[in-house]
Amino acid sequence: QPSVSPGEPSPPSIHPGKSDLIVRVGDEIRLLCTDPGFVKWTFEILDETNENKQNEWITEKAEATNTGKYTCTNKHGLSNSIYVFVRDPAKLFLVDRSLYGKEDNDTLVRCPLTDPEVTNYSLKGCQGKPLPKDLRFIPDPKAGIMIKSVKRAYHRLCLHCSVDQEGKSVLSEKFILKVRPAFKAVPVVSVSKASYLLREGEEFTVTCTIKDVSSSVYSTWKRENSQTKLQEKYNSWHHGDFNYERQATLTISSARVNDSGVFMCYANNTFGSANVTTTLEVVDKGFINIFPMINTTVFVNDGENVDLIVEYEAFPKPEHQQWIYMNRTFTDKWEDYPKSENESNIRYVSELHLTRLKGTEGGTYTFLVSNSDVNAAIAFNVYVNTKPEILTYDRLVNGMLQCVAAGFPEPTIDWYFCPGTEQRCSASVLPVDVQTLNSSGPPFGKLVVQSSIDSSAFKHNGTVECKAYNDVGKTSAYFNFAFKGNNKEQIHPHTLFTP
């Protein structure tokens, strides 16, 4: 019993005066608390308490469940305790099977003994299985067995408290350890799509997947720069131990233009946080935007190939595409395909392949595309560059020599005189008249140029060259002069192709 100095309040005294008392099941428990300021007896087992205001605690027929700590307290708050074991061979353990452990912390298996004189108080695995090699524990007959530093691998470990009684091993009821993992990494978050494009009134639904070691992970959808609470629905799964998945689905049943913006799926645990965003764009109606990939004015040489290429954004998806030339629709020679196979792709490519173009095939080539909301078109003006062709070369009645040439770009006509039999004509002759004539063909066709010189200027035998040229090439025509006396006897025109 405690001893104190006179004058100071002293703790109560208990009879019998020992710290531990062992009684047999069915026997009487009689505990007397002596103190002038007696207040109460308190009985505690498995952390549950009962009180008694009588100074003598009497249990006539003791049961195993009367095992526990009996504490007498006085008005000064001073107390004294005795621990009573009620030995019951049929009930060696008192148990509370709720058993939770936090990873890396200790946890108590609550299986206090009713008989302190049994031996080898320890833990055993269920069904004869060994305990994990690294599992350490400390037994305390009055409280239970403390597992030290719980590991994640112990989750759902089945175990018994065990003692040896009269040479035989006796097991308690089963305990199943539920381990709460410590968060050692941030949650993993992903989103079903990084961007969404919708028309007003359509439903917006996006799913965020959150993965972590337990359901204690926190997650929410937030709208950036807004505090508005968003409506979410959850589905969750445990894919085995410490592999938890949650799907948080955000839905706006009828999206409006002002719902456009960035939505963030945010998740955190005690280790840290992670987030992922998705962008919503809501348009009042669909659209098509066309982007030419080459200049819309195209110059191509006669006989060469050209590809007319457009990219276009279409939402909703395009329904009709066509290429048109001279009011005729191409049935082949073109292809149309999405820019990417991504589910949210709205960009497409269309290519018209024009091969071995003739001079007569210049003109306006138009790409038309439509969806359920809008139509759009883009035109390419194609000019075919052709080498000049001399259409006519004549001596007119008024003595003029005239040369008419066609080509694209517009040909230039130069005149040269070659005296005698010389093959090279170098002396240039200035034309009297140059005109660009309107072509009767389609626009984008060849341009026609007419040039005239006065033949009376020539006094000697020789050849006059009419040379028509442009960026593509040149062509010449020749007039041969022969004088008899003072008269020009003949003028023989002929052409010479000069590549």
Partner: antibody, heavy 117, light 111 residues
């Protein structure tokens, strides 16, 4: 014997918060997990979350995440459940329940929280 | 989460009748032979009261006319002979894994 005594009924406006208390006696408060369960009028029981014994770790039903906080005051053996951003859907009776030997063996008497404009 | 489905949602019976309520879980609630399934009784305006724990164990102080059985996903609460005080709503609950869940309830009414 074990008793859980909860705070009285509350009337709150939408958007407000409520903090319900649950005073425990008859056992070592820090040795047992305390759960919170609610029941909307005419509806079934819904688990809100738990505050674990010992270190005060919590685990919440995702439905209430971000709005609920469970705490304890060990000096008074009292558990608290605070619910924020209340809406009319939060009108319910809120119960605390002590987990013992794997089950909810003891319940508080319940606290009616009415959310009304 | 584990979804618990009770049937029937309501039933009418008379004093003395034998009544069975079932609870089906969307996945097994067993771990090492323990079924983490419990049954509660609730009367209007009162807190739930534990009747059966770990599928088949009668809580102390609960009359022996109440019994529980089942394992894995299928569980049954049986009242062998209905008494007037048994007319109430009954809930099953699992605590194998979080979030812990309850069945939607079975309302037992006097016929």
């Amino acid at each position: 014997q074990v008793q859980l005594v909860q705070s009285g009924a509350e009337v709150k406006k939408p958007g407000a918060s409520v903090k319900v208390s649950c005073k425990a006696s008859g056992y070592t408060f820090t040795s047992y997990n305390m759960h919170w369960v609610r029941q909307a009028p005419g509806q079934g029981l819904e688990w809100m979350g738990v505050i674990y014994s010992g270190n005060g770790d919590t685990s919440y039903n995702q439905k209430f995440k971000g709005r609920v906080t469970m705490t304890t005051d060990t000096s008074t053996s009292t558990a608290y459940m605070e619910l924020r951003s209340l809406t009319s859907d939060d009108t319910a009776v809120y119960y605390c329940a002590r987990e013992r030997d794997t089950r909810f063996g003891n319940w508080g008497q319940g606290t009616l929280v009415t959310v009304s404009a | 989460e584990i979804v618990l489905t009770q049937s029937p949602s309501s039933l009418s019976a008379s004093v003395g009748d034998r009544v069975t309520i079932t609870c089906r879980a969307s996945e097994s609630v067993d771990i090492y032979g323990y079924s983490f399934m419990h049954w509660y009784q609730q009367k209007p305006g009162k807190a739930p009261k534990l009747l059966i724990y770990l599928a088949s164990n009668l809580e102390s102080g609960v009359p022996s006319r109440f019994s529980g059985s089942g394992s894995g996903t299928d569980f049954t609460l049986t009242i062998s002979s209905l008494q007037p005080e048994d007319f109430a709503t009954y809930y099953c609950q699992q605590n194998k894994e979080e979030p812990y869940t309850f069945g939607q309830g079975t309302k037992l009414e006097i016929k």
